[in-house]
Interface confidence: medium
Amino acid sequence: LQDPCSNCPAGTFCDNNRNQICSPCPPNSFSSAGGQRTCDICRQCKGVFRTRKECSSTSNAECDCTPGFHCLGAGCSMCEQDCKQGQELTKKGCKDCCFGTFNDQKRGICRPWTNCSLDGKSVLVNGTKERDVVCGPSPADLSPGASSVTPPAPAREPGHSPQ
């Protein structure tokens, strides 16, 4: 025997109190698949969360974060505050990247500058808190006669300066 509830489409639930009639989901609830015996409560985007998509009878609301924050986790389950480029978020708030590290985004951690010498290259542009170094041609390519480009002074090795 086929379950009569399997005929209930998304946006409805199989109401056991009414002889398994398909009843529409009540306000502020939804069912995204057919054959449901209950409707799920819609997510509410409160506080730092903003509504990106309203709840409907067949799909949950979707949230994003208010300006100055960004989403974390599946379905934007959390909001995390932005920092400026050249900073990372710590327990003490936004802190500048240590010398030798950079962050070119408003989120995430400071990462070490690229070590150009590992690839046999020279530093073309020094790194900053906001930008990685730019590696240039290898020193061999800059030997007399090979090029007229004068290599810039190499950047200091990555290290941690006190904050």
Epitope: G47, V48, L72, G73, S77, M78, C79, E80, Q81, L89, T90, K91
Partner: nanobody, 123 residues
Framework: EVQLVESGGGLVQPGGSLRLSCAAS????????MIWYRQAPGEELEWVAN????????YYVDSVKGRFTISRDNATNSLFLQMNSLRAEDTAVYYC????????????????WGQGTTVTVSS
């Protein structure tokens, strides 16, 4: 239901004091970092202070250091913000928020917020 409810806001003169409270319910309060944020009229939300699970770590935005004190009482599921030497620029809606539980990589994310309490500093 997971809930945070702030109270204690009001109108105060410059140099005055207020103590904000945040009552938590519906989750194991002592497992989470807790955070105070504020939003001045027309401005973005600003982090004010945070406190770890047992109250041994506390951090503040530079503009409130030495004037504001964050604390918590895990026995009563309560978070507090003692605000002294208040200034006009402290006028804002103050929100408490639940932070990370220390076991996830979303350590600095917030997922539960209160409705806010308004602090007005004016003579």
């Amino acid at each position: 239901e997971v809930q945070l409810v702030e109270s204690g806001g009001g109108l105060v003169q410059p140099g005055g004091s207020l103590r904000l409270s945040c009552a938590a319910s519906g989750f194991t309060f002592s497992n989470y970092w807790m955070i105070w944020y504020r939003q001045a009229p027309g401005e973005e939300l600003e982090w004010v202070a945070n406190i770890n699970q047992d109250g041994s770590e506390k951090y503040y935005v530079d503009s409130v250091k030495g004037r504001f004190t964050i604390s918590r009482d895990n026995a009563t599921n309560s978070l507090f913000l003692q605000m002294n030497s208040l200034r006009a620029e402290d006028t804002a809606v103050y929100y408490c928020a639940r932070g990370g539980d220390g076991y996830s990589n979303s350590h600095y994310g917030m997922d539960v917020w209160g409705q806010g309490t308004t602090v007005t500093v004016s003579s």
